[in-house]
């Protein structure tokens, strides 16, 4: 009873339940491979509880181990398009601070038009995650085809 | 000590740990694209703790943000089969209540024989999730090749 | 307040937050399809909190339902390589104790060079998970391309 009350009284953030699910906003100019994300209930089913967006990139607010997941679908794509455009590659990494810059997750499209994956990784408050799509094919903005999210798992 | 005792005394359901992992039961008639799922320890490694099955579709019992994941493998498939039968598409969505109907997750097979993905999404008590496989290829019923599950993550 | 204090005082392990993320160490001799994993902060972003490695295979220390995830990328690979070497298949399963041996997750590469998936499954203390890569193509050891992990979800 006491635990249940305490659980209700404490703000969720103090339990460390940081979580975010983002939808694609736009790409940058052709020499900038980053995808720019957006989130919030007004946009549909995307949300940020803890992490924040900084110029379309996801910034972490709480140290811990996170499950990072992503799916990206190419907007104009058939298996022949995808193979003609090889290599089209998606990489998720820490892009700032520069001292912590590292690639966390990397996939190539080869003959497919969608990549999807997930991994556990330690992240620290202030880490900004960037998702780089190399190649010239545009990603789909459909919210069920392209999305990116993180979930705090443990300290 | 007190917290540990309280945690043991409280039923798990009150902590919001709803979770389900389902295996494929069967497909419907050709004009019904839905996959029909089954779960329970008697069937192997599938289970439902909180959510329920309603005529083979998964119904949510607790409001919250969920991690939804799926893998579907086509039963008789090679890369040539998959491309010849293109488009074969898998979509996971809320199919009832009708007022909340929306596609959450969509993937095409293109030249592959398996799709797998996951995403975070808010779900409400009473939401029923449907998994629609469009195209003429049948999915594999092997429990290590085709499965569908949800995990409650936070309120 | 009392809950917050209790949460800080209790070791994380007693809350059941077992989690591991591993990177590829090496493959075995050609007649041994298992991948051999390694983990620890000295190696980069891999870690073991609860589970242990036993000769490169992951051993579970706590009963519960786990999210198991994996990504494997083939080292020297194009869509033509992948299709020419078909079937290259990745299977994750319980390999010991022998009485609990079962395949949990299986994917073929077909014309792709990366597979990635995840599933929920019950695991018991002492279960050892093996990841079998059949075929002659070698996996990439890049830590952002090939990884394997588990996360305790609930009892």
């Amino acid at each position: 009873q006491r635990f249940a009350q305490a659980q209700q009284q404490l703000p969720l953030e103090s339990l460390g339940w940081d979580v975010a699910e983002l939808q694609l906003n736009h790409t940058g100019p052709q020499q900038d491979p980053r995808l720019y994300w957006q989130g919030g209930p007004a946009l549909g089913r995307s949300f940020l509880h803890g992490p924040e967006l900084d110029k379309g990139q996801l910034r972490i607010h709480r140290d811990g181990i996170y499950m990072v997941h992503i799916q990206v679908t190419l907007a104009i794509c058939s298996s022949t398009t995808a193979s003609r455009h090889h290599p089209t590659t998606l990489a998720v990494g820490i892009c700032s601070p520069a001292s912590r810059s590292i690639s966390l997750l990397r996939l190539s499209f080869h003959q497919g038009c969608t990549i999807a994956s997930q991994r556990l990784t330690p992240l620290a408050r202030g880490d900004t995650l960037c998702t780089n799509l190399t190649g010239t094919l545009l990603p789909s903005r459909n919210t069920d085809e392209t999305f990116f999210g993180v979930q705090w798992v443990r300290p | 000590q007190r917290f540990a005792q309280a945690q043991q005394q409280l039923p798990l359901e009150s902590l919001g740990w709803d979770v389900a992992e389902l295996q494929l039961n069967h497909t419907g008639p050709q004009q019904d694209p839905r996959l029909y799922w089954q779960g329970g320890p008697a069937l192997g490694r599938s289970f439902l703790h909180g959510p329920e099955l309603d005529k083979g579709q998964l119904r949510i019992h607790r409001d919250g943000i969920y991690m939804v994941h799926i893998q579907v493998t086509l039963a008789i498939c090679s890369s040539t089969t998959a491309s010849r039968h293109h488009p074969t598409t898998l979509a996971v969505g809320i199919c009832s209540p009708a007022s909340r109907s929306i596609s959450l997750l969509r993937l095409s097979f293109h030249q592959g024989c398996t799709i797998a993905s996951q995403r975070l999404t808010p779900l409400a008590r009473g939401d029923t999730l449907c998994t629609n496989l469009t195209g003429t290829l049948l999915p594999s019923r092997n429990t290590d090749e085709t499965f569908f599950g949800v995990q409650w993550v936070r309120p | 307040q009392r809950f917050a204090q209790a949460q800080q005082q209790l070791p994380l392990e007693s809350l059941g937050w077992d989690v591991a993320e591993l990177q590829l160490n090496h493959t075995g001799p050609q007649q041994d399809p298992r991948l051999y994993w390694q983990g620890g902060p000295a190696l980069g972003r891999s870690f073991l909190h609860g589970p242990e490695l036993d000769k490169g295979q992951l051993r579970i220390h706590r009963d519960g339902i786990y999210m198991v995830h994996i990504q494997v990328t083939l080292a020297i690979c194009s869509s033509t390589t992948a299709s020419r070497h078909h079937p290259t298949t990745l299977a994750v399963g319980i390999c010991s104790p022998a009485s609990r041996s079962i395949s949990l997750l299986r994917l073929s590469f077909h014309q792709g060079c990366t597979i990635a998936s995840q599933r929920l499954t019950p695991l018991a203390r002492g279960d050892t998970l093996c990841t079998n890569l059949t075929g002659t193509l070698l996996p990439s050891r890049n830590t952002d391309e090939t990884f394997f992990g588990v996360q305790w979800v609930r009892p």
Partner: nanobody
């Protein structure tokens, strides 16, 4: 200021042709992948064709062989030549630069 302006839409009979144009500011035209999207009545917006700064072009399967996207570097224009039009091509057509900048759209109606 307006970044992208479409023109060329209209009513055409099935089997006919139309040419859509999208005028872009120089800084956008020179730096972004340009694409045409369309939104049929009551449906989601979908990609039709795209062209990179180097001129490489890609098409949605349903328009391949019927539509041609091109860049006019002298005028900062992206054109979409549409032929063998079908009733299912009826939609509002939008020009976009990297999904970041969008035109206001131009209506294309194909009657049977």
């Amino acid at each position: 200021e307006v970044q992208l302006v479409e023109s060329g839409g209209g009513l055409v009979q099935a089997g006919g042709s139309l040419r859509l144009s999208c005028a872009a500011s120089e800084s956008i035209f020179n730096n972004y992948v340009m694409a045409w999207y369309r939104q049929p009545p009551g449906k989601q917006r979908e990609a039709v064709a795209q062209i990179s700064t180097d001129g490489s072009a890609y098409y949605q399967d349903r328009v391949k062989g019927r539509f041609t996207i091109s860049r006019d570097n002298a005028k900062n224009l992206v054109n979409l030549q549409m032929s063998s039009l079908k009733p299912e091509d009826t939609a509002v057509y939008y020009c976009t630069a990297g999904l970041q900048y969008w035109g206001q759209g131009t209506q294309v109606t194909v009657s049977s």
